[in-house]
């Protein structure tokens, strides 16, 4: 259903959105899988303190998603 609230991004997904342009720009020949692998390595080496802003934003988006989905269901729309 195009009107359904969009799936919420994880903290890691938000991080990937930040750094994917650099990885792809510096390594244009990398496959999608290799780009994802590199981003995973970067995320794993990111300090917990610096993961926090991404986690906070993901939590806020989750909160909004839950409100939106509740409102969407209240309208009588199917899952």
């Amino acid at each position: 259903d195009p009107n359904a609230p969009k799936r919420l991004p994880s903290a890691f997904f938000l991080f990937c959105s930040e750094y994917r342009p650099k990885i792809k720009g510096e390594h244009p020949g990398l496959s999608i899988g290799d780009v994802a692998k590199k981003l995973g390595e970067m995320w794993n080496n990111t300090a917990a303190d610096d993961k926090q802003p991404y986690e906070k934003k993901a939590a806020k988006l989750k909160e909004k998603y839950e409100k939106d989905i509740a409102a969407y269901r209240a309208k009588g729309k199917p899952d």
Partner: antibody
């Protein structure tokens, strides 16, 4: 060649404000996280603040949280640090630095710094 | 917070000698996120080593880094006049913490 050039430092009274800028050139600015690091006269290095490539994510050292704001304008290749409620202990040379990753994170390029003096 | 303690505070050596600078972390640190910087008076710091042991671009091979547990070591095999400066280690496991620095001076 990567270049980072800070400006905006100067003498300011306690409680005052200042806005530092860091003009970047020689690389794709929007790909990189950027940071501010400071060094009080005769002292060591202290991390101040971090901003992600898009500017959507930031972090601050406890000593400046709530007083300093980091931002960036990727269309102008410029990093900023808005400093409010300045204290004597904020007196330092402020460096902007590029944060990079290659099997680990590190600062690979630094500007020459701009001196901020907080004094009455 | 992780504390980085460098030793000695000051090291007095002559050109041609070997310098060994130590940096100890108060708790476990990911060695991938450990870097060394050189700073000369009135200048910005310069990256020497990242990932505890990888030399940055353009850094001569007389500089090397190693790790043993929570102790990180920067070694300069044969000191050149240009090497006399202050050296900082920096960890990135919990925010960004620098050591207090080791000043390498001419004896």
């Amino acid at each position: 060649e990567v270049q980072l050039l800070e400006s905006g430092g100067g003498l300011v009274q306690p409680g005052g404000s200042l806005r530092l800028s860091c003009a970047a050139s020689g690389f794709t600015f929007s790909w990189y996280s950027m940071l501010w690091v400071r060094q009080a006269p005769g002292k060591g290095l202290e991390w101040v603040s971090y901003i992600s490539p898009s500017g959507g994510f930031t972090n601050y050292a406890d000593s400046v949280k709530g007083r300093f704001t980091i931002s960036r304008d990727n269309s102008k290749n410029t990093l900023y640090l808005q400093m409010n409620s300045l204290r004597a202990e904020d007196t330092a040379v402020y460096y902007c630095a590029r944060w990079d990753y290659n099997s680990g994170w590190y600062y690979d390029h630094w500007g020459q710094g701009t001196l901020v003096t907080v004094s009455s | 917070d992780i504390q980085m303690t460098q030793s000695p505070d000051t090291l007095s050596l002559s050109p041609g000698e070997r310098a060994t600078l130590s940096c100890r972390a108060s708790q476990s640190v990911n060695s991938r996120n450990l870097a060394w910087y050189q700073q000369k008076p009135g200048q910005a710091p310069r990256l020497l080593i990242y990932g505890a042991s990888t030399r940055a671009t353009g850094i001569p091979d007389r500089f090397s880094g190693s790790v043993s547990g929570t102790e990180f070591t920067l070694t300069i095999s044969s000191l050149q006049p240009d090497d006399f400066a202050t050296y900082y280690c920096q960890q990135y496991n919990s925010y960004f913490t620098f050591g207090q620095g080791t000043k390498l001076e001419i004896k």
